[in-house]
């Protein structure tokens, strides 16, 4: 560790005195202290002499000697007071800049330690300190305002009592800066813009921050726009607003607009797209298939996406039949707006009834005309089966009718004994009918098919079963010949009816 001579912590001299401070170390040494007049520095190997033959109050301060080559970074210090009866203060800085909640050192150094008892800190022109200003004093360093606040950004003076009167230092400006959490907050409105050529448009780019030192600009396709800036301060934030007003837009105004703001913490940017169109437009689309199939009793939501400019003047859902003249309940239709020019319209159809199959159309209108999008809704049904015994062209025939949607497939089973439903162990014969005759097949209705099984002789201790199935379910009908006549059995667990 370097050694300073004289080996005292502080030295008090009068103005005009000669002061010699000598520092000796193992290697080369350096002096560090407030740059001030009249000092001369002589270095001689491992010692360095700081001297003046005309000390002034401006030489008051702490002088530290360090050994740059010392890995431990040891240093020695001495504080020099040059006690000038006319100058109780040596102010080392005209301005102090700190962030909020940091301690702010106002470096007015007392030139005479005897005056310490009568010191105080005031604002310029003798105004008292603001309430809740918490400060302390050190004759070597000055006044420290603890946990400085933005509102304490003021001009201060240090005051000392000399011979019963207060003597002020020159003023020190304190700038307490807001702690800037990051780049300025940005808004760019609208988020998207569409205009017809010749219409007016407005784009507003605004940025705000707790600190006034930030820049904001608006650019169009990477070209910075020259727009007058409006500034404001509210809610403890500085706001800067750029408003681009276009009286009659044209195609060259279209494109990407970016609002960019920056401060010491960095840069933020946000963008929007401006479309200029020749005329009004209205586009309807759906992510769903326009042909829908749903099992009876289940629910369905029909969704239509609308892209339009100008906005819609009217819209509605309509049921086009074929079953009834009922119209969808308004409470089942709702609209959600994705953004200014895109909307989603939903029609909810819960617990679908047979009479609700058919065509549903969404109609919308704007100044560009009207458009419609139509969904076709077909209901799926499990098969319903019935069997009768009849003679066709003199031959005994079992006739099976099955109706459902999608079109059912038909299988005949012959099994031993009398039963409501043939099981595997009883089955004697199985016939698949790959091409049953279609009796009816109208849009949105069930498909009815008929299958014929020609039986030369009915075996009386046997059961004939017609089974039908489709993607929804299956149905069956058992036919049991009885000597007194044919007897038919629908299964016990027969069909669910909505």
């Amino acid at each position: 560790i370097p050694v300073i001579e004289p080996s005292v912590p502080e030295l008090v001299v009068k103005p005009g005195a000669t002061v010699t401070l000598r520092c000796v170390g193992n290697g080369s040494v350096e002096w560090d202290g407030p740059p001030s007049p009249h000092w001369t520095l002589y270095s001689d190997g491992s010692s360095s002499i700081l001297s003046t033959n005309n000390a002034t109050f401006q030489n008051t301060g702490t002088y530290r000697c360090t050994e740059p080559g010392d890995p431990l970074g040891g240093s020695a210090a001495i504080h020099l007071y040059v006690k000038d009866p006319a100058r109780p203060w040596n102010v080392l800085a005209q301005e102090v800049v700190v962030f909020e909640d940091q301690d702010a050192l106002l470096p007015c150094l007392l030139t005479d330690p005897v005056l310490e008892a009568g010191v105080s800190l005031v604002r310029v022109r003798g105004r008292p300190l603001m309430r809740h200003t918490n400060y302390s004093f050190s004759p070597w360093h000055g006044f420290t305002i603890h946990r400085a606040k933005f509102i304490q950004s003021q001009d201060y003076q240090c005051s000392a009592l000399m011979g019963g009167r207060k003597v002020m230092s020159i003023s020190i400006r304190l700038k307490v800066q807001k702690v800037i959490p990051g780049p300025p907050a940005l808004t760019l409105v609208p988020a998207e813009l569409v205009r017809i050529r010749g219409e007016a448009a407005q784009i507003v780019c605004s940025a705000s921050s707790v600190d006034v030192n930030f820049d904001v600009f608006l650019q169009h396709n990477n070209t910075k726009l020259a727009i007058p800036q409006q500034s404001d301060f509210h809610n403890n934030r500085y706001q800067k607003v750029l408003t681009l007003n276009l009286d009659q837009v044209d195609f060259q105004h279209a494109g990407n607009y970016s609002c960019v703001a920056s401060n010491v913490q960095g840069k933020h940017s946000t963008s929007m797209f401006f479309r200029v169109v020749e005329s009004a437009y209205l586009n309807l689309s759906s992510e769903q298939n326009l042909i829908q199939e749903v099992t009876v009793g289940e629910g369905l939501n029909l969704k239509v996406m609308v892209e339009a400019y100008p906005g819609l003047q009217g819209f509605n859902w309509t049921y086009l039949g074929p079953f009834s003249d009922h119209q969808p309940e308004p409470k089942l239709a709702n609209a959600t707006t994705k953004d200014t020019y895109r909307h989603t319209f939903t029609l909810s159809l819960p617990r679908l009834k047979p009479s609700e199959a058919g065509r549903y159309s969404f109609l919308a209108r704007n100044p560009g005309g009207w458009r419609a999008l139509t969904f076709e809704l077909t209901l799926r049904y499990p098969p319903e089966v019935s069997v009768i015994w009849t003679f066709i062209n003199g031959s005994g025939t079992l006739l099976c009718a099955a109706s459902g949607y999608p079109q059912p497939n038909v299988t005949w089973l012959q099994c031993s004994g009398h039963t409501d439903r043939c099981d595997e162990a009883q089955v004697l014969q199985v016939w698949d009918d790959p091409y049953p005759e279609v009796l009816s097949q109208e849009p949105f209705h069930k498909v009815t098919v008929q299958s014929l099984l020609t039986v030369e002789t009915l075996e009386h201790n046997q059961t004939y079963e017609c089974r039908a199935h489709n993607s929804v379910g299956s149905g069956s009908w058992a036919f049991i010949p009885i000597s007194a006549g044919a007897h038919t059995h629908p299964p016990d667990e027969f069909l669910f009816t909505p």
Epitope: P35, H38, W39, L41, L50, R64, A93, V97
Partner: antibody, heavy 116, light 110 residues
Framework: QVQLQESGPGLVKPSETLSLTCTVS????????WSWIRQPPGKGLEWIGY??????TKKPSLKSRVTISVDTSKNQFSLKLSSVTAADTAVYYC???????????WGQGTMVTVSS | QSVLTQPPSASGTPGQRVTISCSGS????????VNWYQQLPGTAPKLLIY???QRPSGVPDRFSGSKSGTSASLAISGLQSEDEADYYC???????????FGGGTKLTVL
Amino acid sequence: QVQLQESGPGLVKPSETLSLTCTVSGGSISSYYWSWIRQPPGKGLEWIGYIYYSGSTKKPSLKSRVTISVDTSKNQFSLKLSSVTAADTAVYYCARSTVVNAFDIWGQGTMVTVSS
Amino acid sequence: QSVLTQPPSASGTPGQRVTISCSGSSSNIGSNTVNWYQQLPGTAPKLLIYSNNQRPSGVPDRFSGSKSGTSASLAISGLQSEDEADYYCAAWDDSLNGPVFGGGTKLTVL
């Protein structure tokens, strides 16, 4: 061994604020006094101001436009010069000030042009 | 206009001794010490002399400084081609309460 490095934009528009940062490496910014000095093209040197801890002293003719601040956590000090004109076009240097007002360590300098 | 006055140019041949003057007033050179800086083309200034006549380590003893009253001078003996540079004097100014520089002298080695 202490080294200084200036950084900041090389082009500033008239009436805007010039902002430069000086990064101190190889030593602590908490010791010594740190200065900003500039040199217009083909001209001499001009002291702008110095900072110690968080307090700064500035050349009187520039005082109203200059802010010098320090960030001890980053070992950096910075210069802000507001309302710039073409006359502020210069190479800006940061330097360490000694007790005898000598600038013993200098950054390499950064050229700042004020132009629209 | 610089506070301290220096001749704009000086020249000498290799091996020669050259002196550059710096004139001030009682508020600067008259009451404070003088420092000298060398600025080689395209580089930052370098401290050459401090406290009137002190050389930082690494500066050749061909460079020397002196002060008398309100003037100071820098002498370079045994001039070398690498000495071709701009030289600036500087001193604390009591009225400005800060350092001031001379306008600089361009030294040409012929």
